[in-house]
Amino acid sequence: VPRWRQQWSGPGTTKRFPETVLARCVKYTEIHPEMRHVDCQSVWDAFKGAFISKHPCNITEEDYQPLMKLGTQTVPCNKILLWSRIKDLAHQFTQVQRDMFTLEDTLLGYLADDLTWCGEFNTSKINYQSCPDWRKDCSNNPVSVFWKTVSRRFAEAACDVVHVMLNGSRSKIFDKNSTFGSVEVHNLQPEKVQTLEAWVIHGGREDSRDLCQDPTIKELESIISKRNIQFSCKNIYRPDKFLQCVKNPEDSSCTSEI
């Protein structure tokens, strides 16, 4: 008789999840010399240990601490790029602008990017059928807690001028419920971070509005100012240039000093 299995509202664990994590770890440590000391099998064991045999609605940041310790990494604290609802463009940017880093350019972010995972209480099985949805089921699920943990640490590490890329095409350019709005904004350290500079990416060159005047940007400015961090905002009208440079990163026109 097949065991009863909890049916969650979200998609199940990404197929070949263990192999994917391990392969990504090996690839990352090969490309990044400063992380060559990392033992990828230990990383996978720590990752697995965070959610296997645990109820997928009862995961804590503490569960991820062994993984966090193994994935400890130093990135230049003044070269951090946060993003909200515009991941692809942010990643394309750091692929060409090699001296800036998103969370997904770090080992832990790279391992988990675009993956879903969860286990089951009291069994060593990975659940490939369904995983908890943040809204419909529970917020303390393995994926959400992971991103909350790594995002908090990433924001805490930032210093000087921190940039955030925001999607000017969305109704809420700044969304308090996004990871950026709910975690990263509140974990920037005022004693280290001088300014948060928002880059609001316009949908196209023809859109000449000042999106830095958007009410949600004013809300972000208010939150940041109350935390004694300066805020500035720039309209960015040229996503076409981003894409051109992603296709031809070797072009000399694709170097921009911010």
Epitope: H202, R205, D210, Q213, K234, N235, Y237, K241, S252, I258
Partner: antibody, heavy 121, light 105 residues
Framework: QVQLVESGGGLVQPGGSLRLSCAAS????????MNWVRQAPGKGLEWVSG????????YYADSVKGRFTISRDNSKNTLYLQMNSLRAEDTAVYYC??????????????WGQGTLVTVSS | DIELTQPPSVSVAPGQTARISCSGD??????VSWYQQKPGQAPVLVIY???NRPSGIPERFSGSNSGNTATLTISGTQAEDEADYYC????????FGGGTKVEIK
Amino acid sequence: QVQLVESGGGLVQPGGSLRLSCAASGFTFSSYAMNWVRQAPGKGLEWVSGISSWGSSTYYADSVKGRFTISRDNSKNTLYLQMNSLRAEDTAVYYCAREDGSYMTDYFAYWGQGTLVTVSS
Amino acid sequence: DIELTQPPSVSVAPGQTARISCSGDNIGHYYVSWYQQKPGQAPVLVIYSDSNRPSGIPERFSGSNSGNTATLTISGTQAEDEADYYCQSYNGTYVFGGGTKVEIK
């Protein structure tokens, strides 16, 4: 080193046409968006037109829309500005300028020496 | 489109500091560049992205931009700094200020 050399300017009657050229050298021409900027005698700078690196997108100031056409030939490293229905107010030195600042910001790092267009009867 | 307004002229004694303003509605929300133009010559980029200096431009040139005003500062002005200066921004189209003539007294 980067060089931009404009040619094709001259005296033309109102309603007439002129084609300006800009020969580029010292850089990979096909990697850069290019622009035309003009300056009327004793006046300030005015952006006229721009074209993307491969020529797929073109942009115009309202004052020249429908009358001027920007184009480029990457095989010849040359930028063009076809000016039709010329008016007295089009009289200016026309500069060819290379657009830099690929991601966040846009500016003109290199300029040609300019070619004078005079529209007069 | 954003409108950029510059004072027609700024007069400064040699060795003193010249400040050229470029005002526009929330200009701080846009990146600003500055160009120097001497009589009969093409413009030369002196500042881009608000405050960055291209290679070859002396350190006495600096820029800032916040609120409704961008500023080009020339510290310890020299005779060769006498020229017209233009601010420029971009909001889907390129916009130039009207230009400021810097005179060295």
